[in-house]
Interface confidence: low
């Protein structure tokens, strides 16, 4: 069950004429007849199988149609149907001229038709309006349409009946597809099953209405997750109903017998440790200096002769104290001290006894330190070398290794970089803050004028017979070093032939 809705929006008949071409007098008082039927490939006359509807006169010639759904429900036009929507349709919209007030078909002349449009197609159920516009030679009609389900009908074809309810038989509303949607607090196929209080134990609790948690026998608590122990259980708990599992220190059928005498009565004295050994039974483990069943009797701690190596014992309020003889120390005089007889001084240090030999002191030679002269003196720790010099320990003294350009005991003196004549081939040296610069004579270049820039005499390959060519930099000439069997300034003559016969 559903409704085909047609919303007429605008009709244009600018010349105010009928379909026959004849003008309306005084203007075309226009109303519409709508026919909705099953799908036809070619829309033909015949019964309007899905329904018909007519409008009153909506305007003259050209006009916009007001959305009047609130006041009387005339626009959109309603074409209800009581069957499963097939998804296809044919629609005929006729515009008629009403000369008088009687709009019945039989009361109108047949030529009162202004225009007729026929469309067909697919149309799914939904809230979306489909907009369309149909134009003929003289008129234009703009409209939109849709199919929606009637109340309580749902699904793609409006075939699914669903009526919301909230009673013993169900608590639900309907989804757009017609499926049930349970009201808050309800579940199950027909939403008849209440959802218990969140956390209510699945097995031990139940409910007859939402957010409730009723306990089954033997269980208690807000969420029915606490068991009820056996009646008369005194100092015990349960993990299942009617159980009595005794707390620590308690026994008996109802956990009413005291097994933890230590905790409940504290019988041990003077900080002793108490251990339970049965009902009303305990054992005290005494701290040193105490005895008795409850450690109530005090012992003298010196009775056990705790001091060694001839130390004498003195009783004190919180224990005892050992007075050690010379050469021994520690809580029980168990440690012996060193004396000069043990040669404790290293690196040639000399030993001096103190306090009648009870202890000693070492006098260290130069370069060594420490209570036993075991540490070598490092004279470089104060970083005495300036200008990035490296400090080196050399026996009893130290020395600085200076970076280039510095001298002096502590590298504190700046050396003239030009003092060692670094510029070659007569170059002029200039001292700069961070080094030097050479001004080179003609024919030389490079940082130290070491590169000869005049023409290389060997460049023209003057030597013959695979001789090796050398440039004489002082004279700017070449020298040929001849291979075996050749002579001449260019090695041009073979040995044994006169010079007048060059090879």
């Amino acid at each position: 069950s559903g409704v085909f809705q047609l919303q007429l929006q605008e009709f244009i008949n600018e010349r105010g004429v009928l379909a026959s071409g004849r003008p309306c007098e005084p203007g075309c008082r226009t109303f519409f007849r709508v026919c909705l039927k099953h799908f036809q490939a070619v829309v033909s006359p015949g019964p309007c199988t899905f329904g018909t509807v007519s409008t009153p006169v909506l305007g003259t010639n050209s006009f916009a149609v007001r959305d009047d759904s609130s006041g009387g429900g005339r626009n959109p036009l309603q074409l209800p149907f009581n069957f499963t929507w097939p998804g296809t349709f044919s629609l005929i919209i006729e515009a008629w001229h009403a000369p008088g007030d009687d709009l019945r078909p039989e009361a109108l002349p047949p030529d009162a038709l202004i225009s007729k449009i026929a469309i067909q197609g697919s149309l799914a159920v939904g809230q979306n309006w489909l907009l369309d516009e149909q134009t003929s030679t003289l008129t234009r009609l703009r409209y939109s349409y849709r199919v929606i389900c009637s109340d309580n009908y749902y699904g793609d074809n409006c075939s699914r009946l669903c009526k919301k309810r909230n009673d013993h038989f169900g608590h639900y509303v309907c989804q757009p597809d017609g499926n049930l949607s349970c009201l808050p607090g309800w579940t199950g196929e027909y939403c008849q099953q209440p959802i218990c209080l969140s956390g209510c134990h699945e097995q031990n609790g139940y409910c007859s209405k939402p957010a409730e948690c009723l306990c089954r026998p033997g269980w208690q608590g807000r969420l029915c997750n606490e068991c009820i122990p056996h009646n008369g259980c005194r100092h015990g708990t349960c993990s299942t109903p009617w159980q009595c599992t005794c707390d620590e220190g308690w026994g008996g059928l109802f956990c009413d017998q005291d097994l933890n005498y230590c905790t409940h009565h504290s019988p041990c004295k003077n900080g002793a440790t108490c251990s339970n050994s049965g009902q009303r039974s305990y054992t005290c483990t005494c701290r040193p200096g105490y005895t008795g069943v409850d450690c109530e009797l005090e012992l003298s701690e010196c009775d056990s002769n705790p001091c060694r190596n001839g130390g004498s014992c003195k009783d004190q309020e919180d224990g005892y104290h050992c007075l050690c003889p010379p050469g021994y120390y520690g809580l029980h005089c168990e440690h012996s001290t060193l004396s000069c007889a043990d040669s404790p001084c290293f690196n040639g240090g000399s030993c001096r006894e103190r306090n009648q030999g009870a202890n000693y002191a070492c006098e260290c030679p130069p370069n060594f330190t420490g209570s036993n002269c075991e540490k070598k003196v490092d004279r470089c720790t104060s970083n005495p070398c300036a200008n990035g010099g490296q400090c080196l320990n050399r026996g009893p003294s130290r020395m600085c290794r200076c970076r280039p350009g510095f001298t002096g005991t502590y590298c504190e003196l700046h050396v003239s970089d030009c003092a060692r004549n670094p510029c070659a081939h007569g170059g002029t040296c200039h001292d700069l803050e961070n080094g030097l610069m050479c001004t080179c004579p003609a024919g030389f270049s490079g940082r130290r004028c070491e590169v000869r820039t005049s023409i290389d005499a060997c460049a023209s390959s003057p030597c013959f017979n695979r001789a090796t060519c050398y440039t004489d930099l002082s004279t700017d000439t070449f020298v040929c070093n001849c291979p075996y069997g050749f002579v001449g300034s260019r090695c041009e003559f073979p040995v044994g032939l006169p010079p007048s016969f060059p090879w």
Epitope: Q7, D67, N128, W129, L130, L131
Partner: nanobody, 123 residues
Framework: EVQLVESGGGLVQSGGSLRLSCAAS????????MSWVRQAPGKGPEWVSA????????YYADSVKGRFTISRDNAKNTLYLQMNSLKPEDTAVYYC????????????????WGQGTQVTVSS
């Protein structure tokens, strides 16, 4: 007659924002679902976002989810698209349209389109 007029496009840098508007006239705007569609140079139309007639339900293409927000003001007959965190691939002509039907991912057919507004995102 139905008219849809888009505005608010322009040139913006990557990461920037724009707000598009679509002024509707010639039909009962509040009765219709509305949609934004875009067409990049040399490509077919791509559905961007849609909103139901009352404005309570909104839908977005995966490519714009979390960056674009569709809204409408039925009293002013205007549809909006707020575009944040724009990317160069958002460059296109943006159209507002009345959807004619829905496919699995969104509207796939449109009854009416506007003339469009150009959005260019530079990197």
């Amino acid at each position: 007659e139905v008219q849809l007029v888009e505005s608010g496009g322009g040139l913006v840098q990557s990461g920037g924002s724009l707000r598009l508007s679509c002024a509707a006239s010639g039909f009962t705007f509040g009765s219709y679902d509305m949609s934004w569609v875009r067409q990049a140079p040399g490509k077919g139309p791509e559905w961007v976002s849609a909103i139901n007639s009352g404005g309570g339900s909104t839908y977005y293409a995966d490519s714009v989810k979390g960056r674009f927000t569709i809204s409408r003001d039925n009293a002013k007959n205007t549809l909006y698209l707020q575009m944040n965190s724009l990317k160069p691939e958002d460059t296109a002509v943006y159209y507002c349209a009345i959807p004619r039907g829905w496919g699995p991912t969104g509207p796939h057919e449109y009854a009416y389109w506007g003339q469009g507004t150009q959005v260019t995102v530079s990197s």
